[in-house]
Amino acid sequence: GELETSDVVTVVLGQDAKLPCFYRGDSGEQVGQVAWARVDAGEGAQELALLHSKYGLHVSPAYEGRVEQPPPPRNPLDGSVLLRNAVQADEGEYECRVSTFPAGSFQARLRLRVLVPPLPSLNPGPALEEGQGLTLAASCTAEGSPAPSVTWDTEVKGTTSSRSFKHSRSAAVTSEFHLVPSRSMNGQPLTCVVSHPGLLQDQRITHILHVSFLAEASVRGLEDQNLWHIGREGAMLKCLSEGQPPPSYNWTRLDGPLPSGVRVDGDTLGFPPLTTEHSGIYVCHVSNEFSSRDSQVTVDVLDPQEDSGKQVDLVSAS
């Protein structure tokens, strides 16, 4: 006869491990007992369980409540046992010793490998600001056994660096993603991807990039100066900028207070029917936590009558 077992049994932390040991004997041979022991190198054998043909299953005190026989139907030549709720400390070498009649004793060893799936964590780096050099965007750490693989999935251009720390029964891997911040990266996903044999599928943690910036400010509304004449209604100036975080807007008049009746509505300055009092230099002040910008324009409200007089004069002068 001969013993059938596995060289390696792999199980995920918390799952039940089946330790196989099957005696393939000749007809008429009987198994008297199967003794299981843990036999790690450098340590004495530690008894695990005994499957006895007459007495049944004995579980040694160290494994009380954790070792069972596989569910029926059971073959009397099958000495396999189930180790319930495998923990990392269970990883190691195991031996089954089978006492048979009349063939004698046989033994076989297997290695139990307990996979510890990682629980990854992603930590964003310091606040990203346009104009910075190479900056840490995020770091991702995962600890497991064996060491997990940590990679990045993103459209953003950057560089990665990884380091590993070995512990007694596991390894922690940290990967960092560095980039040169630019406003085009705003809102882009940066995904940490963790692979491990104990995971059914890769674990992914996504971080949305936020890059602080403030664009140059400009004012729209004066494209056609001829529209800015006395009596015109609905005239307005709009301040144009963009930023992260979204900026706030403030309007002032350089050469005095804002005229009465002028309405400030965020980025827009609304005028009542135009008078010459509305002529002046207007300043749009744009700011966010990152920076501030100014843009100024000169409003010159035309008097159509003065204009026509001038034209006549000009004509007559010619």
């Epitope: 008297g32 007992q33 003794a35 008894e47 005994l50 006895h52 007459k54 007495y55 049944g56 299953l57 004995h58 040694s60 005190p61 010793r97 006492s99 004793s105």
Partner: antibody, heavy 126, light 107 residues
Framework: EVQLVESGGGLVQPGGSLRLSCAAS????????MSWVRQAPGKGLEWVSV????????NYADSVKGRFTISRDNSKNTLYLQMNSLRAEDTAVYYC???????????????????WGQGTLVTVSS | DIQMTQSPSSLSASVGDRVTITCRAS??????LAWYQQKPGKAPKLLIY???SLQSGVPSRFSGSGSGTDFTLTISSLQPEDFATYYC?????????FGQGTKVEIK
Amino acid sequence: EVQLVESGGGLVQPGGSLRLSCAASGFNFSDFDMSWVRQAPGKGLEWVSVIKPSGDYINYADSVKGRFTISRDNSKNTLYLQMNSLRAEDTAVYYCAREYSDVVDYVSVRTPLDYWGQGTLVTVSS
Amino acid sequence: DIQMTQSPSSLSASVGDRVTITCRASQGISSYLAWYQQKPGKAPKLLIYAASSLQSGVPSRFSGSGSGTDFTLTISSLQPEDFATYYCQQHYTTPPTFGQGTKVEIK
């Protein structure tokens, strides 16, 4: 025929010592685990100690640990129990017994006691 | 330690009676249980091992059953030589422990 014969019992004062012997015959002594079991007058059975054939595994009941020592001489087919610091509650008939040898190389379990000696009485009294 | 509780502690019966003695373990012991018979002034004698296996030379009127925590010794037809004290013993763990005994007396 399997035979186990105990000797060495007697009257001893509290704190005294006694050495019991058990002569075995009719079987291959060096193949079997051997135990001592005692029985106080009018009481039930209490396991005392066990020793494996090579002497590499020994165990004791908590009540005698540190006071009693089990040993064996396979060349003489003899089992011993050295009893020190004896107390009144150690008064009992002491039996040596052979363990049934149907469990191989597994120390966490004991096996039934299939042969017993006739016993020797130990009386601890002042 | 595993506690073994026998019941009854004593019983009176007549020759030819069917006698049942029970033994309960404080935790599961599979079939690691033996039954012994002891007569006054004599050493115990192994009757049953592995809960239900009859020791060589023991009359077939003795039988054992049970597994886990509850066990039974049955004498199918009590004979005069069967009046004695009976002990159960677990050998699942060290120390092996005995029940307190059941004395079978003549009615």
